[in-house]
């Protein structure tokens, strides 16, 4: 079942999935000056069965200059496009995705693809957050979000991550203001603040957590 909305946005952070559950859509988006071909697919779809999953449909972009399309849209400033959902500054090492039944790998790029990938995730999907270059992580708990179904509605859990500028002085644990979840309380009441300035440690920790999450998903 599709998640109704997108994963939460964390200032100065990006998110990435390590593998994609069946039913996930990846919109066929093209870079500036290009557009999806009219007869082409709207999206790629992670499809298959419990033993093998793959991406259905192919995305194709064509030069928008060749088409008579009037630009009647207020252009969006480039600087607003900070969050790139699939461009991690220090890519996490993916787990062996082939060993995850019902999941697809990251699809290969297509010609003239947009810089940001737009996914429609399904219930049970987990995404990982990481601070963009120039920012470091203050953790109160896992830097992850899961799409959950409760009372017939979908919601994403709130990742316990704050990204602070390297030049800023970080708060001491006692001074740290709680990062509230959508329900108005921290998701992990007992989690303590983990401050790490070492990006490599953070990446390895995330990769380790990713492995453990994907193994527990099927238990």
């Amino acid at each position: 079942e599709l998640c109704d909305d997108d994963p939460p946005e964390i200032p100065h952070a990006t998110f990435k999935a390590m593998a994609y559950k069946e039913g996930t859509m990846l919109n066929c988006e093209c870079k500036r000056g290009f557009r999806r071909i009219k007869s082409g697919s709207l999206y790629m779809l992670c499809t298959g069965n419990s033993s093998h999953s793959s991406w259905d449909n192919q995305c194709q972009c064509t030069s928008s200059a060749t088409r008579n399309t009037t630009k009647q849209v207020t252009p969006q400033p480039e600087e607003q496009k900070e969050r790139k959902t699939t461009e991690m500054q220090s890519p996490m090492q993916p787990v062996d995705q082939a060993s995850l039944p019902g999941h697809c790998r990251e699809p290969p790029p297509w010609e003239n693809e947009a810089t940001e990938r737009i996914y429609h995730f399904v219930v049970g999907q987990m995404v990982y957050y990481q601070c963009v270059q120039g920012y470091r992580a203050l953790h109160r708990g896992p830097a992850e979000s899961v799409c959950k179904m409760t009372h017939g509605k979908t919601r994403w859990t709130q990742p316990q991550l704050i990204c602070t500028g390297e030049m800023e002085t970080s708060q001491f644990p006692g001074e740290e203001k709680p990062q509230a979840s959508p329900e108005g309380r921290p998701e992990s009441e007992t989690s303590c603040l983990v401050t790490t300035t070492d990006f490599q440690i953070q990446t390895e920790m995330a990769a380790t957590m990713e492995t453990s999450i994907f193994t527990t998903e099927y238990q």
């Epitope: 909305d5 093209c30 009219k38 007869s39 709207l42 088409r67 630009k71 429609h120």
Partner: antibody, heavy 114, light 107 residues
């Protein structure tokens, strides 16, 4: 929560034009195209066209070229459709739709009457 | 344009029954088909995408199947709240086109 809020019903004269709006909330407006659909009793649903607020491109169903004009304002996360040279055939409910057909607005009823 | 046909305009069923609504495309549309439910006075609600995948909040008694040109929406254990009109849509090629709709009546 993802929502598409459409403007209210319109009673218009033949030969005039009407502009309706569709305000998006709960998602990144520039990431998803917005389509428009016409529904008339006994005529089912018809796809009018769609606009990609981020990419800036627009596609029209040839049947509605010259009749419908689609625009979008990213600053207010609002899509617009203008219908011109209205006739009784344009009396219908018009829906906006986004997020790969998952979300539909509540519809705008347009009545063309002298 | 790809023509989408729902041959049955009306279907009558009873609570607890199983009913299948069919849809035929004039050319191969792969699995690029969606199903919608529209109750009187309401906007269409998306049920199924890519021929067989349910949207969130859609009861699992609704299942979609098919590929190519023939598609089916099956409602098992029909409930009184399923009284509605059901539309299929192809989005394989532009312009996207809809079936004429099938009205489900509960006996």
């Amino acid at each position: 929560q993802v929502q598409l809020q459409q403007s209210g019903a319109e009673l218009v004269r033949p030969g005039t034009s009407v502009k309706m709006s569709c305000k998006a909330a709960g998602y990144t407006f520039t990431n998803y195209w917005i389509g428009w659909v016409k529904q008339r009793p006994g005529h089912g649903l018809e796809w009018i066209g769609d606009i990609h607020p981020g990419g800036g491109y627009i596609d029209y169903n040839e049947k509605f070229t010259g009749k419908a004009t689609l625009t979008a304002d990213t600053s207010s996360s609002t899509a617009y459709m203008q219908l011109s040279s209205l006739t009784s055939e344009d009396s219908a409910i018009y829906y906006c739709v986004s997020r790969n057909f998952a979300k539909w607005g509540q519809g705008t009823l347009v009545t063309v009457s002298a | 344009d790809t023509t989408v046909t729902q041959s049955q305009k009306f279907m009558s069923t009873s609570v607890g029954d199983r009913v299948s609504v069919t849809c035929k495309a004039s050319q191969n549309v792969g699995t690029n088909v969606a199903w919608y439910q529209q109750k009187p006075g309401q906007s269409p609600k998306a049920l199924i995408y890519s021929a067989s995948y349910r949207y969130s909040g859609v009861p699992d008694r609704f299942t979609g199947s098919g590929s190519g040109t023939d598609f089916t929406l099956t409602i098992s254990n029909v409930q009184s709240e399923d009284l509605a009109e059901y539309f299929c849509q192809q989005y394989n090629s532009y312009p996207y086109t809809f079936g004429g709709g099938t009205k489900l009546e509960i006996k």
